[in-house]
Amino acid sequence: SEVEYRAEVGQNAYLPCFYTPAAPGNLVPVCWGKGACPVFECGNVVLRTDERDVNYWTSRYWLNGDFRKGDVSLTIENVTLADSGIYCCRIQFPGLMNDKKFNLKLVIK
């Protein structure tokens, strides 16, 4: 079952997700998507990182923390009721089926 997080309409929502990088110059790609984590990748991707940078994002989504040290928590700006639902944080460790998947439920009041 998903861990539940709450935010109020018009505020910013925070969805935590963390990992420990092996080395600063060798980050693990991460994707965030709207909807539960599928078998591979993220569905409806809202943000993605590569070995160094955030390389894809949509306008209201960002990583406010130090993602290069493994804080890949997602901030969603100025949420509405439509932002309610399940979000997937997927940490894409190398190797087959090594990904760590986290489903987080966002409830907007």
């Epitope: 590569d50 940078d53 390389n55 994002w57 960002w62 993602f67 290069r68």
Partner: antibody, heavy 114, light 108 residues
């Protein structure tokens, strides 16, 4: 102490190419990214791209793809930027900067003129 | 790409005056990777403030930085003549990394 020492000024003709160097010292060259930045006279700064000397991996600003090529020589701790098909728009000061943009080279002035 | 808009583009301040420079991002960026640089004519940019609010080595305590998400600022509590320079904000969380257009701060 950490230092980035760049090559000297260049005066070249349009259509030619140039290779600018950035010699790193005071740290383990292969452990940290090198960034390259362009500044035209009296204007702002533009990020060109980075290279990770440990692997040779590169990433370019889309605007500079096909214009700039980043390489390294790990044996001498030197990062290079090759600029091709030069035009007057490429006249600028080019900086190398350290992994976290905390250390910068002194800049290399490139003038493209016929 | 993320556009960083700095304002004002040029400003003058008297010694002792409080000065605030702003940097607005077109989309949210990590506060860990929002930096400010000081640049004087003929010199390389110098790291001035890193991770939004941390002063680089040797930067006087009259400087401070704050912000998060899409809105950041650099403040000088008491302007001094040596502070006359151009200041650039910079984000290097999202690729391509981008710089603001700069604020040229002059002494009155």
């Amino acid at each position: 102490q950490i230092q980035l020492q760049q090559s000297g000024p260049e005066l070249v003709t349009p259509g030619t190419s140039v290779k600018i160097s950035c010699k790193a010292s005071g740290y383990t060259f292969t452990d940290y990214y090198i960034n390259w930045v362009k500044q035209r006279p009296g204007q702002g700064l533009e990020w060109i791209g980075w290279i990770y000397p440990g692997s040779g991996n590169t990433k370019y600003n889309e605007k500079f793809k096909g214009k700039a090529t980043l390489t390294v020589d790990t044996s001498s701790s030197i990062a290079y930027m090759h600029l091709s098909s030069l035009t007057s728009e490429d006249s600028a000061v080019y900086f190398c900067a350290g992994d976290r943009f905390d250390y910068w080279g002194q800049g290399t002035t490139l003038t493209v003129s016929s | 790409q993320i556009v960083l808009t700095q304002s004002p583009a040029i400003m003058s301040a008297s010694p002792g005056e409080k000065v605030t420079l702003t940097c607005s991002a077109s989309s949210g960026v990590s506060s860990s990777y929002l930096y400010w640089y000081q640049q004087k004519p003929g010199s390389s940019p110098k790291l001035w403030i890193y991770s939004t609010s941390n002063l680089a080595s040797g930067v006087p305590a009259r400087f401070s930085g704050s912000g998060s998400g899409t809105s950041y600022s650099l403040t000088i509590s008491n302007m001094e003549t040596e502070d006359a320079a151009s200041y650039f904000c910079h984000q290097w969380s999202n690729s391509p990394y981008t710089f603001g257009g700069g604020t040229k701060l002059e002494i009155k």
